[in-house]
Interface confidence: low
Amino acid sequence: RGVFRRDAHKSEVAHRFKDLGEENFKALVLIAFAQYLQQCPFEDHVKLVNEVTEFAKTCVADESAENCDKSLHTLFGDKLCTVATLRETYGEMADCCAKQEPERNECFLQHKDDNPNLPRLVRPEVDVMCTAFHDNEETFLKKYLYEIARRHPYFYAPELLFFAKRYKAAFTECCQAADKAACLLPKLDELRDEGKASSAKQRLKCASLQKFGERAFKAWAVARLSQRFPKAEFAEVSKLVTDLTKVHTECCHGDLLECADDRADLAKYICENQDSISSKLKECCEKPLLEKSHCIAEVENDEMPADLPSLAADFVESKDVCKNYAEAKDVFLGMFLYEYARRHPDYSVVLLLRLAKTYETTLEKCCAAADPHECYAKVFDEFKPLVEEPQNLIKQNCELFEQLGEYKFQNALLVRYTKKVPQVSTPTLVEVSRNLGKVGSKCCKHPEAKRMPCAEDYLSVVLNQLCVLHEKTPVSDRVTKCCTESLVNRRPCFSALEVDETYVPKEFNAETFTFHADICTLSEKERQIKKQTALVELVKHKPKATKEQLKAVMDDFAAFVEKCCKADDKETCFAEEGKKLVAASQAALGL
């Protein structure tokens, strides 16, 4: 029942062009090129894409034409290597072009930059955007794909097509509305926030595949799909996991045409086999392709089958445990994970993977013992502390969130994480801590049964952002250790970190705490970021500062900003009152 076509095609580029259609083909090639060459101007990419598309058409017309039999990596790599400014713009990335495939593509992948030096995207006035949209809709939408792809080099390409479709729909509707801004801006905000979340989730999938291997990704997929489709047989879940792994391996590897094509095939298969997968898929399967794939990926968990037998019978009490394990270790562990996950939609995926790892370690030890059954008889007792640890942590943090609200909860996390890893750059600490803090509003509203999967799996995504940003410029052995030792234990590893006693406090620099009138015109979010940046710098100067000291300084700071933003001569106020604030803060913190 394999989904993916195995027949050989004389021309891979013609095959994908015909499967995907011209519009999707061009969009996906643009995404691929923008994710590789993140600094190239838009016009250069459009030219490259048009050239590739025309070539693909020649191959559609005649598959045996010269070069049509070349692999997509060869064709696309050759095209990227024609960029005249490669050496000046990308430095050593130009050396990739001296390599042969597959090494050349691997080289391009290694040079993808998670934090490219690109200007922040500034949203123009609504009328300006609507004019641009009406003047040239195609260019406008291509520009959207390009700007997102170059800033998010691991964005899930077929999902980006779905975002672009929604982006187009928003402009089509709202540029005709009486109040264009009221219609459009909330939609763009929603797309921006969803897009950031989607990018971060996909980045974790790619990190899982690239840093920890296919087995780690498959284990994650078994657990997640078993929670989502608890009525499906193990063989069905295994089949979906194999296909899903292929899709994500392709997208993470830059094979975006194959990835999009295979994702469409997988959606088709799932919808054709709904009866043996899940009762929740009906609505999704009635939608057009892009919406269908997105809907399936987000579908709610199906109801658990009634009267599932106890897990202990097959995995602890049975005399055949070691025999079954020895015969096919990964299949047996996969079955354990499947059976445990389908019974526990209330657990996070990472917790389920920790339990499976504990079970595996126990079997490895016990199946070599004199009395294996006696040895592994109490294995389920070992699970109790593993389950209680995230439960307690979530309970405590949700209580703190409810007490403080999101902004102050973020500040508490900023202080906590700056003390744990003060070597990390201030912008990274602010970004990561702000995102960690969003777990409160995202997950604490849920009932107990949904809190852990929401919170801990979200935290895995955010901590992966820290890991990939830190990997680019490593500054902390503690971060490296937590990020690389175990994918599923990253969050417990960071939670367990205490204040870094080896850290030498940063020299005090008054310039860091000098503010100007421009802060008054910032949005509330931007103003928060300015204040949170100052808070991180304070902790770096005085890591031993107490919560009370830091709160006093931050309250003074908020009052200072409010006062000067109301002043007639704002700039003078910021200069004079700022000096007083710095002096008072130094005194309060003993700097």
Partner: nanobody, 115 residues
Framework: QVQLVESGGGLVQPGGSLRLSCAAS????????MAWYRQAPGQQREFVAR???????NYPDSVKGRFTISRDNAKNTVYLQMNSLRAEDTAVYYC?????????WGQGTLVTVSS
């Protein structure tokens, strides 16, 4: 960049002949391959003939024996001699050229085969 201009299209009766020309200008030193494609209304673009710098040619079965591609390197021109024309040869004929891929295209010339 390479510019391509086709000429020679027109109305011809079934069984008749026509010769299309394609003149190339611009960065022509990079051109290694030139070809003809055609597109009938509502159809996908279809490969018709190709000639490499060295002079080797290839054709699909639908035109083999009836059409001949040739080039005059001195004039930077490629020709398509079409004999025994049929109604199904009616289409816009495009000239294409490129160093590796046929990435530069002309605007096309219309050929109508009708009695």
């Amino acid at each position: 960049q390479v510019q391509l201009v086709e000429s020679g299209g027109g109305l011809v009766q079934p069984g008749g002949s026509l010769r299309l020309s394609c003149a190339a200008s611009g960065s022509i030193e990079s051109i290694n391959r030139m070809a003809w494609y055609r597109q009938a209304p509502g159809q996908q673009r279809e490969f018709v003939a190709r000639i490499s710098k060295g002079g080797s040619t290839n054709y699909p079965d639908s035109v083999k024996g009836r059409f001949t591609i040739s080039r005059d390197n001195a004039k930077n021109t490629v020709y398509l001699q079409m004999n025994s024309l049929r109604a199904e040869d009616t289409a816009v004929y495009y000239c294409a050229a490129g160093p590796v891929w046929e990435q530069f295209w002309g605007q096309g010339t219309l050929v109508t085969v009708s009695s």
